[in-house]
């Protein structure tokens, strides 16, 4: 039975040209995390595997940095980076947990962080 929950940074915003940290946290389970995938709806950004370490998708190599922790740092943001991001936790024995973050990249210098929320 899957008892865990994923807490994410929720809806966040950042300035064009800046950087942002995408963070998720899996709690309420003793399951072992074997791999975390960071994905957009139609594109794998990176994986962090317990054995293989970090692997960044080649097309994002120049502007995605691993960490901190199991999070992901997006750099040199453009308005095209606006959209949904997913942290996908592969765990044993529970299975797969998915968290969602919505990032809005703003032209202006006003960029506030949204509230944290949980996805069961």
């Amino acid at each position: 039975m899957m008892t865990g929950t994923i807490e994410t940074t929720g809806n966040i915003s950042a300035e064009k040209g800046g950087s942002i940290i995408l963070q998720c946290h899996l709690s309420s389970t003793t399951a072992q995390v074997t791999q975390v995938n960071w994905e957009q709806q139609d594109q794998l950004l990176a994986i962090c595997n317990a054995d293989l370490g970090w692997h960044i998708s080649p097309s994002f190599k120049d502007r995605v940095a691993p960490g901190p922790g199991l999070g992901l740092t997006l750099q040199s943001l453009t308005v095209n980076d606006t959209g949904e991001y997913f942290c996908i936790y592969h765990t044993y024995p529970d299975g797969t947990y998915t968290g969602r973050i919505f990032l809005e990249v703003l032209e202006s210098s006003v960029a506030e962080h949204g509230a944290r929320f949980q996805i069961p």
């Epitope: 074997t34 791999q35 794998l44 293989l52 370490g53 692997h55 080649p58 592969h90």
Partner: antibody
Framework: QVQLQQSGAEVKKPGASVKVSCKAS????????IEWVRQAPGQGLEWIGV????????KYNEKFKGRATITADKSTSTAYMELSSLRSEDTAVYFC??????????????WGQGTTVTVSS | DIVMTQSPDSLAVSLGERATINCKSS????????????LAWYQQKPGQPPKLLIY???TRESGVPDRFSGSGSGTDFTLTISSLQAEDVAVYYC?????????FGGGTKLEIK
């Protein structure tokens, strides 16, 4: 163009070890994972393990843990798969394959030509 | 580990006819959060390495003829060749692309009747 060039056929005695090489060219070696897969005569495909040349980290099929060792040499863009304590059931064609990112998926997009390993006394 | 089971083991189809190969996984390959199925199909001809045909259960690899199509979701998947050509004689494998180990099905040998 992307190429994976594997070493030549090997004949080994039971209990010996074999080391198969896979030289990559035509792309940035450290940006892609390299997988190893084998195929016994007339049989299907069996995943052995994978290496991340960027980090040096490797992961193995439980069946081969302790007997298979996958390494990578960044200076020569070459991956290696060593299998020890060989037995007759290890007679197979051994393939290396590059893992490309296709949308959301990790896909074995380019393959070596295969290396035949025969284990016989 | 995820176990991939293909059926049938072998299949003989007349030229121009439809060929259907099934693949069943022991665990779901669907990530419902992003609605993606992590399943790939490969074709292998004698003496050659496998060649990617389909990924994401239904997306054709560039250059693959449109007579090849993939369908299914969760644990049940199908590869269909709408009109068999002589060059399609090969062994076809499905692969779990969801989590390591990236296990393969046992293969389906496709021949001409």
């Amino acid at each position: 163009q992307v190429q994976l060039q594997q070493s030549g056929a090997e004949v080994k005695k039971p209990g010996a070890s074999v080391k198969v090489s896979c030289k990559a060219s035509g792309y940035a070696f450290t940006n892609y994972l390299i997988e190893w897969v084998r195929q016994a005569p007339g049989q299907g495909l069996e995943w052995i393990g994978v290496i991340n040349p960027g980090s040096g980290g490797s992961k193995y099929n439980e069946k081969f843990k302790g007997r298979a060792t996958i390494t990578a040499d960044k200076s020569t863009s070459t991956a290696y798969m060593e299998l020890s304590s060989l037995r007759s059931e290890d007679t197979a064609v051994y393939f290396c394959a590059r893992t490309g990112v296709y949308g959301n998926f990790l896909i074995f997009d380019y393959w070596g030509q295969g290396t035949t390993v025969t284990v016989s006394s | 580990d995820i176990v991939m089971t293909q059926s049938p083991d072998s299949l003989a189809v007349s030229l121009g006819e439809r060929a259907t190969i099934n693949c069943k996984s022991s665990q779901s390959l669907l990530n419902s959060g992003i609605q993606k199925n992590y399943l790939a199909w490969y074709q292998q001809k004698p003496g050659q390495p496998p060649k990617l045909l389909i990924y994401g259960a239904s997306t054709r690899e560039s250059g693959v003829p449109d007579r090849f199509s993939g369908s299914g979701s969760g644990t049940d998947f199908t590869l269909t060749i709408s009109s068999l050509q002589a060059e399609d004689v090969a062994v076809y494998y499905c692969q779990n692309d969801h989590r390591y180990p990236f296990t393969f099905g046992g293969g389906t040998k496709l021949e001409i009747k």
